[in-house]
Amino acid sequence: ECVIKLFSDIYFQGGDITTVYTPNAKHCQVVCTYHPRCLLFTFMAESSVDSTKWFSCILKDSVTESLPKVNMTGAISGYSFKQCPHQLSACNKDIYVDLDMQGMNYNGSVTKNAQECQERCTNDAHCHFFTYATRQFPSAEHRNICLLKYTQTGAPTGIRKLKKVVSGFSLKSCALSNLACIRDIFPSTVFADNNIDSVVAPDALVCRRICTHHPNCLFFTFFSQEWPKESHRNLCLLKTSESGLPSTRIHKNQALSGFSLQNCRHSIPVFCHSSFYYDTDFLGEELDIVDVKGHEACQKMCTSAIRCQFFTYSSSQESHNKGKGTCYLKLSSNGSPTKILHGRGGISGYTLRLCKMDNVCTTK
Amino acid sequence: ECVIKLFSDIYFQGGDITTVYTPNAKHCQVVCTYHPRCLLFTFMAESSVDSTKWFSCILKDSVTESLPKVNMTGAISGYSFKQCPHQLSACNKDIYVDLDMQGMNYNGSVTKNAQECQERCTNDAHCHFFTYATRQFPSAEHRNICLLKYTQTGAPTGIRKLKKVVSGFSLKSCALSNLACIRDIFPSTVFADNNIDSVVAPDALVCRRICTHHPNCLFFTFFSQEWPKESHRNLCLLKTSESGLPSTRIHKNQALSGFSLQNCRHSIPVFCHSSFYYDTDFLGEELDIVDVKGHEACQKMCTSAIRCQFFTYSSSQESHNKGKGTCYLKLSSNGSPTKILHGRGGISGYTLRLCKMDNVCTTK
C-alpha cells in the first residue's frame, strides 16, 4: 500500500538499517526509496530535543512492512515510495539555506553564485554535493567560496546550521552533467584501479547499471562465469581513481570493463534489470517459496512482493510438463545475489519494481 | 582449519558484526565461538592506544573465512573455535582483579568474599555477572558489597579498571546453579509475560534449546504450525519476568510453553538440534546449493561448511528414484530459519557443529 503522507512528531521504533544525514524529511524519503532494503524511515528535524541528532535520517526495514509508532517531538516518519506506482527520480535541485552539508572538501574555488557552484559540482566526476559561502558570510576570506564535497556513501556525514551558506546536491541524476558519457564495454579488459566495492552480477550490463547507481563508482570490471578463479566468477568490481579515468588497462580473457552511465541521458533503463538469466540460480536470503506457472509469473510475483529483489524459478521435468514450477523470492543487503550458480537449470531475474526509478529522458 | 593461537598486535580489518566487552582475549574468543555468525575477532587490550576502546571485543565474519591483517599495538586477533573439533564450554570460572564489569546493578548485598558473591550470582535467575568490592576498597560504605548485574546481551556494556574490586561471571553454564530445573513442557499453554525476542523454530524442543542459550530467556511460548494466525506459526517467543516465573498462564490450543534449561545439568544436548524435519522447508540466506545423496549427506555437508547453520534437502520424484537430491545450505543472522514452510516435500535440519558446544555433565 502506497503511503505518501509524512507523520509529524512520530518515531518508528526499531528496524534500523543505517543512519544517514539529509537536509529534510522529503529527501530522507527519497534516500529510503532508493536504498535496497529501506521500507520506512524517521527523520529528526531541528525541532527535536537532541541537537546532535538533527538532520539524521534513520532508514528502517520490517518483515511486516510496519513498525510501532511512538510520540516524539521533532521526529518525522514515513514510508518509502517503493510501495508506490508513480515514476520516481533521485534528481534534487533544491538549495538549502543556512545549512552546511559535511563531507570531504576536496576542491574549493570562487564562483559567482550558488548556481555556478552547483554546476561545477554537477560537472565534476567525484562531487556529490556542495556548500557555498555567500557574500554575506562573516569571514571575508571564505566569501563566494564553492566547496565541492564527496563521501563514501554519497550522503553527507553530518549537517549543521551555519549562517550565510547554502548547500545542494550534484544534478548528475537530473541528466544535467556535461561530463563525457562513455557507453563502450571493453571485452577482455581489466581496469587496475581502486576497488570501492564488489557485487555479484549475472553479466556486464547489470554490473554497469549497479556501477551507475553507486555513489562513487566511475568505472567497473566484470569477471564472467568462465573466469579461471572460481571465487571471482560473476564478480563485478566497482572502481574509482583520482583522475576519474582508469589508469591501467590489462588484457585478460573472460573479463569485461566499462564506465558508469551517471553522466548519460538514458534512452534505456539503467536502474532495473529486466532480462531473464537461463540455467542460472541466484542465491540470497529467501523471502518465500511459491508455486507459479512459468518464470514470467515468478518475476511478477517478485515485483509485487515489496521486499523481493530477485528470484529463481525452478521446475523439475515432471512439474515442467504440467507448466508449473517453484518460485524462490529472495533479497540481500545490497539488492544483488550473494552468489550465482550455473548449470542447475534455474531461471533467474530481478524485480521490475526498480524500473519506475529510472530517469525518463532523451538520449544524449 | 582450526587456528587456536592468538595474534598479538594484529587487527583484522573489516567484517565487523558487533562489538561486545570482554575481560580478555581468551573470553572474546569464546564469545565469538558461541555467536551464530562470528568466525574471527579482534580484542583491544589495555596496551592499545585508545583507552576508550580497551576491553572491546569486535566480532567479525567473512565469506572467505579470513580478513586482512593490519599491525596495531595492543590489538589481539584470532579465530573462533567453530573450526575446531574439540569439545567446548561457555563455563568461565575466572575472577578478574581490578576490573569493574558494567551492567544493570539490580541487587546489592554484603557477602563474605568474592566466591560467595559469585555463588549468589549463579543462584539468581537474572544474574549474568557480578562485581565485588573487597575489604580494601577505598570507600568504606561499599566494602564487601556484592553487585549482581545483567544486560540485554548477557555481556558487560563496558569494562573499566577499578582498584580493589573483582568481577566474574555466573557459573550457570558450568552446571553449578542450584536454581530449580523445570523440564516440563506444557501443552495448550501460553505464558503472557515480556517477550524479549522471537525466533522461528520447527518445534517446542528447538524453541526450548534456543531459550536455554539466550542470555535473558527464562521461559518461552511456542506456536505450532497449526496456530490460527499465520504470521505466528512456528514462532518461538522468548520471555522473562521480574520474578523469573511466568505470571499468567493462558489456555490456548496449538501453543506450548516451558522453561529455559539454563539451571539444569544435561544428559541430553541442549545446544544442537539433531533431528530431521520432514515435509518442511527452512528459509534463510543461501550459502550454496549442491547435489547430494540423501538428507543425511546434506546434514553432513552443512556441518562441514563452517558458515552453514541449517539446510533443506529437496528431491523431485525423478531424482529421488536415483537416490539423489539438492542440498540447500543456509544461514541467518541468529542461526534460526527466517521462515518455515510445510507441505513442499523438503527435509530440513540444522548443522551438528554446535553439538560440541554442549556441557558434558550428569543429569540433575
Epitope: - | 535467575a125 546453579s177 542450584n178 530449580a180 530445573c181 511466568p246
Partner: nanobody, 124 residues
C-alpha cells in the same frame, strides 16, 4: 495478609508415617514454588522437599528421597508432605514456605512466606 498454616504433625514410632498439610490464604501456590523445611534443635534449617506448582516438578533432599513425597491440590490451595519410613533423625519442627521468584528449591534463604511450623517427633 499472607498466611501459611501447617498441620498433621505429631509423635510416631520409627518406621511409621505422617502426612503434613500446608494451607495458604492470601497467597496462591499456582505458578510458585512451595517448600517443606525442617529445623532440629541446635541445627540449621534445611530443605526437605519442594514443588513447582505449575506442572508439579518436585525436588527432594538426598536424606528423604524415596521416603517422602510432596504433592499439591491446587483447588484447595494446599500442599502435602507424605512422610513414610520415618527415622529418629527426622525429628524436627517442619515449616511450609512459599517463594515468589525462581529459587534454588531447597534453599530456605530464598523463600518469602513462612508458616509457624508443626512439630514431628519420631521415637525409636
Amino acid at each position: 495478609q499472607v498466611q501459611l498454616v501447617e498441620s498433621g504433625g505429631g509423635s510416631v514410632q520409627a518406621g511409621g508415617s505422617l502426612r503434613l498439610s500446608c494451607a495458604a490464604s492470601g497467597y496462591t501456590f499456582n505458578n510458585n514454588f512451595v517448600g517443606w523445611f525442617r529445623q532440629a534443635p541446635g541445627k540449621e534449617r534445611e530443605g526437605v522437599a519442594a514443588i513447582y506448582s505449575l506442572g508439579g516438578s518436585t525436588y527432594y533432599a538426598d536424606s528423604v528421597k524415596g521416603r517422602f513425597t510432596i504433592s499439591q491440590d491446587n483447588s484447595k490451595n494446599t500442599v502435602y508432605l507424605q512422610m513414610n519410613s520415618l527415622r529418629a533423625e527426622d525429628t524436627a519442627v517442619y515449616y511450609c514456605a512459599g517463594a515468589i521468584t525462581w529459587v534454588p528449591p531447597l534453599s530456605h534463604r530464598r523463600y518469602t512466606y513462612w508458616g509457624q511450623g508443626t512439630l514431628v517427633t519420631v521415637s525409636s
